[in-house]
């Protein structure tokens, strides 16, 4: 069963998942001037058993101008997008995927991938919203939306978030007991296809809304 819509749009906000439920698909998209290799995967799929989940398939891109280039494996940590704001002493190595049964972590970037990610979510997936830089949340803390099924139909719950243009506070404000408001809980675990974008967020992030897709350039 497909989700009828994308996650709700909130003006001046972006959304992201903490982790991805099994069954989630990520399109293998390449940046301009590149294309998927012939016989390459169309998508990555989060699969697993009761104790271990991981992304099946590898996304591989090759230059549109060359025919025989098939190099493109997931980049090594030192080649991956730098996590500039964390001042890590060494590259952060993800822990074993088994630590999140039923879920996959954010897939690492692949060489020449597109600047936006298109995910196909399953029912029960939760995404979290935050105001973009330059806007503050009237409802403090991360708001969430859940893809849920009710009476045989899928829908996304409405996140409780309003972003207002106040430059002096962060997009994730709040010293005094901020909150996040869940609305509703998923009632079944059938599939829900949703096209959306994913982001590699930096604190100094900028986001623009184009039709129903949020686009953020990788930093």
């Amino acid at each position: 069963e497909l989700c009828d819509d994308d996650p709700p749009e909130i003006p001046h906000a972006t959304f992201k998942a903490m982790a991805y439920k099994e069954g989630t698909m990520l399109n293998c998209e390449c940046k301009r001037g590149f294309r998927r290799i012939k016989s390459g995967s169309l998508y990555m799929l989060c699969t697993g058993n009761s104790s271990h989940s991981s992304w099946d398939n590898q996304c591989q891109c090759t230059s549109s101008a060359t025919r025989n280039t098939t190099k493109q494996v997931t980049p090594q940590p030192e080649e991956q997008k730098e996590r500039k704001t964390t001042e890590m002493q060494s590259p952060m190595q993800p822990v074993d995927q088994a630590s999140l049964p039923g879920h996959c972590r954010e897939p690492p970037p692949w060489e020449n991938e597109a600047t936006e990610r298109i995910y196909h979510f399953v029912v029960g997936q939760m995404v979290y919203y935050q105001c973009v830089q330059g806007y503050r949340a009237l409802h403090r803390g991360p708001a969430e939306s859940v893809c849920k099924m009710t009476h045989g139909k899928t829908r996304w719950t409405q996140p409780q978030l309003i972003c207002t243009g106040e430059m002096e506070t962060s997009q994730f404000p709040g010293e005094e007991k901020p909150q996040a408001s869940p609305e509703g809980r998923p009632e079944s675990e059938t599939s829900c296809l949703v096209t959306t974008t994913d982001f590699q967020i930096q604190t100094e992030m900028a986001a623009t809304m184009e039709t129903s897709i949020f686009t953020t350039e990788y930093q």
């Epitope: 992201k16 994730f172 967020i201 604190t203």
Partner: nanobody, 121 residues
Framework: QVQLVESGGGLVQPGGSLRLSCAAS????????VSWARLTPGKRLEWVSA???????YYADSMQGRFTISRDNAKNTVYLQMNSLKPEDTAVYYC???????????????WGQGTQVTVSS
């Protein structure tokens, strides 16, 4: 290599309390936000709480007023004090670090192995 080690879970009766700890290493702890999330028996992954590098705290509604997050930068440890526990709080609780180190929920990529909390009479 980043390491996150949770402890403090266990079996507790409804209305009881637990204090979870997350000991971190392998990165500059004081400049990073830390989140707690939980995986319910139905395999639902829920964000619980977060604390930013400046000490700002964030809570999900259902935990508001019952849970308190804090950090001790000298010990590279984050704590989650859980009071008035309910059966629906039963879950594996995970300590997590966002990939850019600052935004408490977005882009979490680094997880501990989790600690089981069971609330039952």
């Amino acid at each position: 290599q980043v390491q996150l080690v949770e402890s403090g879970g266990g079996l507790v009766q409804p209305g009881g309390s637990l204090r979870l700890s997350c000991a971190a290493s392998g990165f500059t702890f004081s400049s990073s936000a830390v989140s707690w999330a939980r995986l319910t028996p139905g395999k639902r992954l829920e964000w619980v709480s977060a604390i930013a590098s400046d000490g700002s705290t964030y809570y999900a509604d259902s935990m508001q007023g019952r849970f308190t997050i804090s950090r001790d930068n000298a010990k590279n440890t984050v704590y989650l004090q859980m009071n008035s526990l309910k059966p629906e709080d039963t879950a594996v609780y995970y300590c997590a670090i966002p990939r850019d180190g600052l935004v408490p929920v977005f882009g979490i990529d680094y997880w501990g192995q989790g600690t089981q909390v069971t609330v039952s009479s």
